[in-house]
Amino acid sequence: SAHAHPRDSCPLGPGRCCHLETVQATLEDLGWSDWVLSPRQLQLSMCVGECPHLYRSANTHAQIKARLHGLQPDKVPAPCCVPSSYTPVVLMHRTDSGVSLQTYDDLVARGCHCA
Amino acid sequence: SAHAHPRDSCPLGPGRCCHLETVQATLEDLGWSDWVLSPRQLQLSMCVGECPHLYRSANTHAQIKARLHGLQPDKVPAPCCVPSSYTPVVLMHRTDSGVSLQTYDDLVARGCHCA
């Protein structure tokens, strides 16, 4: 049905399927050193890995996409691993008069799914 | 900044970058013929195409991902083309006693972005 349960066990082997992974990045990596003061390094959680058939399907559309990819792989791409939710991050950034704190809601992934 | 503008012109040539495309699918294709009565065919809008640097970035996370992919392509995947919004779809589906109408909100893509 349109509400088939997404698969949660990875058929490709450990660490191969869509999951959250931490990537360390400096302000220089991000091109932010001119406007962000702190933190100097960020532990960025990102979504990586493959999306085999029905693995962590985001919704009905992703289930359809997975099925049609199986039937028409040249025409329909497989679902891909993207954030399902985010962790807010506070950055201390430079202003004309000094520094201020600002919270960014869409910077670091908290969970992943296949969309 | 964290709010750099996403690019909207495709540097790869027409039709190569993330966009909405229509795929025709039958109930049999979807594996739904046992529980859906109508429509017998669906015009499914899906998100296809590549996500070159900063093209249609979904949010700050996608911009970071694009940048880090440029620096560490083996470790950080490029953003990928996924739905940004959906068109609801009404299906006439079989019940024990006959048919009923049900609307699905997450079945057909209406817009795409790179996440």
Epitope: - | P39, P88, V90, L101
Partner: antibody, heavy 118, light 107 residues
Framework: QVTLKESGPGILQPSQTLSLTCSFS??????????VGWIRQPSGKGLEWLAN???????YYNSALKSRLTISKDTSNNQVFLKISSVDTADTATYYC??????????WGQGTLVTVSS | DIVMTQSQKFMSTSVGDRVSVTCKAS??????VAWYQQKPGQSPKALIY???YRYSGVPDRFTGSGSGTDFTLTISNVQSEDLAEYFC?????????FGGGTKLEIK
């Protein structure tokens, strides 16, 4: 809960243009597969389909009346409109709008009586 | 245009009886036929979709059958509230067309 309600002028004279409005709730005309149709019924007679409009703005008309009919929609306000030009006494009927899904009419309005009289 | 013919304009039955209302299409319409009930002074109400599928909330004494050109709506164990006119409709092709209706009278 799906509801539809028709409104019209009640009485009009021959050769005038009849303007009908269908206001609905409980569904959206931006939903794939959804449509609204107009059907009329002269007193004591059968049902005659007039026109319909779909979520994607496709429009279909009764071939016998096509030159006189215009259907349109205002999706954001949940309204569908039907205009019938050059009315005659034969257009006297109860006019219904109905939610149309894949060809059939799942829910109907209560109807509005239109009388064409000189 | 496809003509839908309901040859019986009136049918008389008693409470508890079984009655069959028929409808004939002028050409093959597959199973793309619906049935509606219209009680006196009311708007039509959907009963059957795709020739044989009862719409949600419709009592199971209403049954649709047929395909191609011949269709039947059967009401078993007729109740007094079934006093109404019954219409068939084809949606196989435009223009959509209705049958002329069959009025069910309760003795």
């Amino acid at each position: 809960q799906v509801t539809l309600k028709e409104s019209g002028p009640g009485i009009l004279q021959p050769s005038q243009t009849l303007s009908l409005t269908c206001s609905f709730s409980g569904f959206s005309l931006s939903t794939y597969g959804m449509g609204v149709g107009w059907i009329r019924q002269p007193s004591g007679k059968g049902l005659e389909w007039l026109a319909n409009i779909w979520w994607n703005d496709d429009k279909y008309y009764n071939s016998a009346l096509k030159s006189r009919l215009t259907i349109s929609k205002d999706t954001s306000n949940n309204q569908v409109f039907l205009k019938i030009s050059s009315v005659d006494t034969a257009d006297t009927a109860t006019y219904y709008c109905a939610q149309e899904v894949y060809g059939w009419f799942a829910y109907w309005g209560q109807g509005t009586l239109v009388t064409v009289s000189s | 245009d496809i003509v839908m013919t309901q040859s019986q304009k009136f049918m008389s039955t008693s409470v508890g009886d079984r009655v069959s209302v028929t409808c004939k299409a002028s050409q093959n319409v597959g199973t793309n036929v619906a049935w509606y009930q219209q009680k006196p002074g009311q708007s039509p109400k959907a009963l059957i979709y795709s020739a044989s599928y009862r719409y949600s909330g419709v009592p199971d004494r209403f049954t649709g059958s047929g395909s191609g050109t011949d269709f039947t709506l059967t009401i078993s164990n007729v109740q007094s509230e079934d006093l109404a006119e019954y219409f068939c409709q084809q949606y196989n092709s435009y223009p959509l067309t209705f049958g002329g209706g069959t009025k069910l009278e309760i003795k």
